[in-house]
Interface confidence: medium
């Protein structure tokens, strides 16, 4: 993994210490040849939680185009989920103040949907370079 990135189960992770909106965070990860983190398992969730600190943090899950989708194409419906009770609460309410179309880890690690412009921390994920 690159310097300052952490390795876990064949992927590399970078944890921000500043805040950006979801679109800005998404763009940042892409410029690093990565993507916003996709959570595939309870174990990966625990790893992320351990390193992110108790602060709202964006992940690569959004329903800006309608249904919830992971940025890397991982199937949302059949995949791992860790929403807070009664969340997400704005699936199709996009006319109400723009809706809450982007998912983030809350301070306890569980997920919430929120306004995508909120300046939260974020986590990038990339496949580990096999050569390293």
């Amino acid at each position: 993994c690159p310097v300052n990135w952490l390795e876990y189960e064949g992927s590399c992770y970078w944890f921000s210490r500043s805040g950006k909106s979801w679109p800005e965070a998404d763009k940042y990860c892409q410029l690093e040849s990565a993507h916003l983190v996709v959570v595939n398992s309870r174990e990966e969730q625990k790893f992320i939680q351990h390193h992110m600190g108790p602060v709202n943090t964006w992940m690569g899950l959004t329903d800006q185009s309608g249904p919830w989708k992971w940025v890397d194409g991982t199937d949302y419906e059949t995949g791992f989920k860790n929403w807070r009770p009664e969340q997400p609460d704005d699936w199709y309410g996009h006319g109400l103040g723009g809706g809450e179309d982007c998912a983030h880890f809350t301070d306890d690690g569980r997920w919430n949907d929120d306004v995508c412009q909120r300046p939260y921390r974020w986590v990038c994920e990339a496949a580990r370079d096999p050569a390293t």
Partner: antibody
Amino acid sequence: QVQLVESGGGVVQPGRSLRLSCVASGFTFSSHGMHWVRQAPGKGLEWVAVIWYDGSNKNYADSVKGRFTISRDNSKNTLYLQMNSLRAEDTAVYYCARDPSVGYDGMDVWGQGTTVTVSS
Amino acid sequence: DIQMTQSPSSLSASVGDRVTITCRASQGIGNHLAWFQQKPGKAPKSLIYAASSLQSGVPSKFSGSRSGTDFSLTISSLQPEDFATYYCQQYSNYPVTFGPGTKVDIK
């Protein structure tokens, strides 16, 4: 009780510098983001800057970007605003305010304010 | 930047009146809106956060609501101590922005 006390205001000439301080008490300072907000005479409220609980993230209003610097010393429970290249339009009462969260959730507690007058 | 507009800019009311002030955001901010009260020569005081949640210690005569990007602050029965200027504020994204204020004075 939760309290914020600003100091450092005064009369200063255009182009000069001033540093404001805000001392916090009655809560765990290092767990909260902090903001500076100002109010020109007879005008409304204008947000100036925010610093996250741990100092990792700082954001500024366009009107002060490049001239003002927000900082904090968690060991002293103190927030600072370094104001350089002051202009007449910076004349205002400056308030520090606590963010209920780490720095992205607005303000819940305000100080009493300190007055800055920029005049030749 | 997100622009906040408030209406009316001022209003005259009598003690006991029900008063409603509205605030509109130029784009979606979810529930990330607060209301503040300010009296002359004093610091602002937080009344409402998250569009409709009452700050601790604030009397229940104050209430907030949201409909899309429109927000309102209602004072159910105006008392002499409520004559002041009221500001809305969005904290959905930086820069944080305030509305221009609504001055509530005695009729």
